[in-house]
Amino acid sequence: AGVFELQIHSFGPGPGPGAPRSPCSARLPCRLFFRVCLKPGLSEEAAESPCALGAALSARGPVYTEQPGAPAPDLPLPDGLLQVPFRDAWPGTFSFIIETWREELGDQIGGPAWSLLARVAGRRRLAAGGPWARDIQRAGAWELRFSYRARCEPPAVGTACTRLCRPRSAPSRCGPGLRPCAPLEDECEAPLVCRAGCSPEHGFCEQPGECRCLEGWTGPLCTVPVSTSSCLSPRGPSSATTGCLVPGPGPCDGNPCANGGSCSETPRSFECTCPRGFYGLRCEVSGVTCADGPCFNGGLCVGGADPDSAYICHCPPGFQGSNCEKRVDRCSLQPCRNGGLCLDLGHALRCRCRAGFAGPRCEHDLDDCAGRACANGGTCVEGGGAHRCSCALGFGGRDCRERADPCAARPCAHGGRCYAHFSGLVCACAPGYMGARCEFPVHPDGASALPAAPPGLRPGDPQRYL
């Protein structure tokens, strides 16, 4: 387990001609925030594929108002790091997408409006525990400067966060072949070797020599599938022969959380909720002050100038916990009606409605969609007595059952070519056209029919704003 950390240094006009206009104005003040999406390996999937390694949203930056006619300077940024926790091993190679969003603070009905200002993407190789890596990426006329690193959460160490540190058994040195755990020199690396024969698919271990089973599997080596029908009593001796799931000692038995932390079970292990002043996998790290940066996800740290006085984290919207480490599950309030699926996008709640229903909270009953299903998260749309599916990104066809090419809808106008790049679709315009989707003709005098936004597009510019 560990955390991927992203530090945004600046977002502003890139070098060269054609400085972009400021995204904010006196009439429409705005502020920026960032979203990062991580995928393992050398992903060639389109931008809309899941962020399998995780995603994070920054806090909102300071409100910014541009003076009329002035070029855009570097824009004010949110405080703090973007942190993406990862539960399993760090993959070493990863793809990233960093989006810069603008929150307009004018008099919009229904609260602020969000719009995507720029998106950059790349593929990188990175070892956990290494130094901050610096990067510069350009999107149109904008330039984003940032640093990133991956670090392991104790007791995990190593370039993939797969080796564990354990307290020394002998005071003087570590066992044969085991090194001290930098920077915890009083601990030793522990080779994580599960019990011989432990199923690599259905078993795992947190202590050398053990074999703990994932849900649905049992037996000393986690090779026996569970058959719940043969269970006579909910608790009793484990039976590897019948394959009956009989809970043995749980991961929270004996409370592994130190310093008054409370333990809750997770599918593969346990999670400690730590009291103020303590953090770490088992709440074992103490003496924390605001200087240690204990507040995650853009939380604001107050007090705690010395180790004896407690600090308090004021969490941004969408996060809670003594260290702002937990994302608030706003979907637990079940805001989506008629069986709609709730999606917490960080900056907004979205309801994905069942076939036959529509509306922001799935409150509208569509008669002609009744009993008709759209697959893969598609939504049924009323249309003159015949149902039609509006498919989620990446899917198409009458019932959204076909895997869609992002270029299938021919998004590039006027004969432009669409390419399925790993960072999202890319348009290459035919001669005489320009813009994100090749929608603007280039006039013979060199001027173009480009509107005021998006800024920074030059003739022949590819698709950059998704």
């Epitope: 060269g16 060639e44 510069i136 350009r138 090419d405 992002p406 270029c407 021919r410 070519r417 669409c418 390419y419 399925a420 790049h421 790993f422 960072s423 679709l425 890319v426 290459a428 315009c429 035919a430 001669p431 030059r458 022949g460 510019d461 590819p462």
Partner: antibody, heavy 119, light 110 residues
Framework: QVTLRESGPALVKPTQTLTLTCTFS?????????MGWVRQAPGQGLEWMGT????????DYASWAKGRVTISVDTSKNQFSLKLSSVTAADTAVYYC???????????WGQGTLVTVSS | DIQLTQSPSFLSASVGDRVTITCQST????????LSWYQQKPGQPPKLLIY???NLEIGVPSRFSGSGSGTDFTLTINSLEAEDAATYYC??????????FGGGTKVEIK
């Protein structure tokens, strides 16, 4: 695993038509790419010959190659091919197939196949 | 016809040296930055180093960097290593769906 592999004759006689095939695996032409051919004469630099765009199967060729080069796709066999007519000794080269998925670069290449034109 | 001119065509440098290769195009590349750099060693296909003028391809050491826009581009190897002995090519993509390669720069280790 995403791969490209070129195949075809190692030796062709002058005036004949050279036909090379590129077999791809690990991806489908239902997505939109440029599939291209690039050649390299012994001791010389890389030379773009042409591409076929899988979105509508339109083709583009280098100015020297127009009229001599034809690129086509057989989606049922996961292959695309190059035909080069009226070959001469100057067409002796290693021929590579390559894939472009946006931003103008060939991110995936075959290993190349050497074709010698000689009588 | 579009021409991409690389200079120098040959250079000899020592391990640890900073090496710069330039690439000049007779026309602006598409989007002003659709230019890439490749490394090629004998008997191997070209290997992508840099795309979109300055983006480092995954797995390529950070000593390689690219810059430039429009018609003038540069590949820099910050601290030359023995394994960097190879031929380097720039390649542009142009309006009208046209590709072109530079003539190549052979880098030798002294």
């Amino acid at each position: 695993q995403v791969t490209l592999r070129e195949s075809g004759p190692a030796l062709v006689k002058p005036t004949q038509t050279l036909t090379l095939t590129c077999t791809f695996s690990g991806f489908s032409l239902s997505s939109s790419y440029d599939m291209g051919w690039v050649r390299q004469a012994p001791g010389q630099g890389l030379e773009w010959m042409g591409t076929i765009y899988t979105g509508d199967y339109s083709t583009d060729y280098a100015s020297w190659a127009k009229g001599r080069v034809t690129i086509s796709v057989d989606t049922s066999k996961n292959q695309f091919s190059l035909k080069l007519s009226s070959v001469t000794a100057a067409d002796t080269a290693v021929y590579y197939c390559a894939r472009h998925t946006g931003y103008g670069y060939f991110g995936l290449w075959g290993q190349g196949t050497l074709v010698t034109v000689s009588s | 016809d579009i021409q991409l001119t690389q200079s120098p065509s040959f250079l000899s440098a020592s391990v640890g040296d900073r090496v710069t290769i330039t690439c000049q195009s007779t026309e602006s590349v598409y989007g002003s930055d659709w230019l890439s750099w490749y490394q090629q060693k004998p008997g191997q296909p070209p290997k992508l180093l840099i795309y979109q003028a300055s983006n480092l391809e995954i797995g390529v050491p950070s000593r390689f960097s690219g810059s430039g826009s429009g018609t003038d581009f540069t590949l820099t190897i910050n601290s030359l290593e023995a394994e960097d002995a190879a031929t380097y090519y720039c390649q542009g993509y142009y309006s009208g769906y046209i590709y072109a390669f530079g003539g190549g720069t052979k880098v030798e280790i002294k």
